[in-house]
Amino acid sequence: LVPHLGDREKRDSVCPQGKYIHPQNNSICCTKCHKGTYLYNDCPGPGQDTDCRECESGSFTASENHLRHCLSCSKCRKEMGQVEISSCTVDRDTVCGCRKNQYRHYWSENLFQCFNCSLCLNGTVHLSCQEKQNTVCTCHAGFFLRENECVSCSNCKKSLECTKLCLPQIENVKGTEDSGTT
């Protein structure tokens, strides 16, 4: 099966790599603009230069292109706790991230929020906090994991999943009491 190509991909595939087909004359292949620039005017004829202009402040192109306009720079979402890792340049978009000891939770493909890494109090770090994943904790005896925090088994209600994890502790306590009464 031949993959479906859009009109632009079809047009570009006629020309060698790094060139695109002139929109008004399909016998002419124009050189694409370098990253950091955009297409101001198509090349007038074969072997003649494409008129490319540098992106203005606040915009960029990250790869060779024949875009009529540069792309607007992204803004880091302060309300999501994001901070700017590197500012936008003519050839690279803004890079946003999280502060130290935070991880990214992606709400959707292009939207993330920064959350503090779990400290694993009353437990140990099983897997360290990473850029896109919270710390994975293992709890000490007498504690169970709830919402990635180690909670005392005294807070374990019968209906919760923690009964399985806290049961040995409860049995041990009963066993000690029984041996003490003989």
Partner: nanobody, 120 residues
Framework: EVQLLESGGGLVQPGGSLRLSCAAS????????MGWVRQAPGKGLEWVSM????????YYADSVKGRFTISRDNSKNTLYLQMNSLRAEDTAVYYC?????????????WGQGTLVTVSS
């Protein structure tokens, strides 16, 4: 077919409270983060709050932090928004939304909305 049905809106005095509900059907509710979005008269859409699949991680717009609480009951396929200390500027149509896992849009399905009017 994905369906999101909001309820609980109405007229309330400033300082009052309301609890919005959203009954979800037509998709596996437990697999998706959910959210509330609002549109005030003559204004654009504003994200209000979001909650992850297990109800652990939440997001609140600065304008509602400390006053609104989002929650979900996965056993009932229902999303909630508890709104306290309501202000006139909270007047809007509130939409329940399913958060998209892919693509550039955060939300891929919306409900019909429920009107919240804060007025004395």
């Amino acid at each position: 077919e994905v369906q999101l049905l909001e309820s609980g809106g109405g007229l309330v005095q400033p300082g009052g409270s309301l609890r919005l509900s959203c009954a979800a059907s037509g998709f596996t509710f437990t697999r998706y983060s959910m959210g509330w979005v609002r549109q005030a008269p003559g204004k654009g859409l504003e994200w209000v709050s979001m909650i992850d699949t297990r109800g652990v991680r939440t997001y609140y717009a600065d304008s509602v932090k400390g006053r609104f609480t989002i929650s979900r009951d996965n056993s009932k396929n229902t999303l909630y928004l508890q709104m306290n200390s309501l202000r006139a500027e909270d007047t809007a149509v509130y939409y329940c939304a399913k958060i998209s896992q892919f693509g550039s849009n955060a939300f891929d399905y919306w409900g019909q909305g429920t009107l919240v009017t804060v007025s004395s």
